[in-house]
Amino acid sequence: CKAMHVAQPAVVLASSRGIASFVCEYASPGKATEVRVTVLRQADSQVTEVCAATYMMGNELTFLDDSICTGTSSGNQVNLTIQGLRAMDTGLYICKVELMYPPPYYLGIGNGTQIYVIDPEPCPDSDF
């Protein structure tokens, strides 16, 4: 069976600088040439779009300039990085993959990556 399934890690811990990275991998049947990747955040039963990018296979993944996401693509694998995260951004981040071309359109949704963000403790003043 070559039906598309989206795989992503269950849990990721953001760095002290508020950066979280994870891989979104999709088993794509056929050879899609245009793929859209969207990151959704689910918290308190509400789903919001974090960022989205469309890319042509073989080209680089490009998010909007003001996006908090960056990423690279390699075959059926997308390496996603989300920046500027704070403790209040802790939640389930879902990778949505759409095969836009050639038809027919196809949608795959991952189970989500729980990203934990811990705000760093403020540094105490040093007295030398």
Epitope: K2, P103, P104, Y105
Partner: antibody, heavy 114, light 108 residues
Framework: EVQLVQSGGGLVQPGRSLRLSCRGS????????ISWVRQAPGKGLEWLGF??????????DYVASVKGRFTISRDDSKFIAWLQMDSLKTDDTAVYYC?????WGQGTLVTVSS | LPVLTQPPSVSVAPGKTARISCGGN??????VHWYQKKPGQAPVLVIY???DRPSGIPERFSGSNSGNTATLRISRVDAGDEADYYC???????????FGGGTKLTVL
Amino acid sequence: EVQLVQSGGGLVQPGRSLRLSCRGSNFNFDDLAISWVRQAPGKGLEWLGFVRSKAYGETTDYVASVKGRFTISRDDSKFIAWLQMDSLKTDDTAVYYCTTFNYWGQGTLVTVSS
Amino acid sequence: LPVLTQPPSVSVAPGKTARISCGGNNIASEAVHWYQKKPGQAPVLVIYYDSDRPSGIPERFSGSNSGNTATLRISRVDAGDEADYYCQVWDRTTDQPVFGGGTKLTVL
């Protein structure tokens, strides 16, 4: 409910022109290529051509048998696509469908006869 | 263009399983889609990407693809399944879709 609603069609004389319309609703129309497929009486499905999405510059491709006679275009602001058929022949008689392959219009009969 | 070969007709008794084949050179390397076409109605996508069912399509419809043959299976066939069935792939060389010739399914 996702819909592709077609209009146009009917009886036309050989050598004349006809334009079919296809209006989409309740799906990401502007993201998807819109194809036209026909079925002549007693025959199978035949893909005629398509207009790709804006991501591809709304470029078009056609099957050899209609290239130069048929033109496909779209206006995403109106969620509509067209099939302009010129220099029609009797063997263009068929039911014509617009489609994204996930979704299909209801079909419209074009009869080319003198 | 790749050539997709389907049997012109398949007959099956009610309640049995219908199998409709779609042959093509190394078709397993392609994504195969299946459409149901009833007289006077628009085609309906019943299986896409070899084996997935769009929403609203009964579980009785399934698909597989290996070697040089893709297969559409319809289990517990009933009279409402009588239709023409078409396989389709996307030809990457020409960037165009290709349909099989279609198979008329008759429920005895």
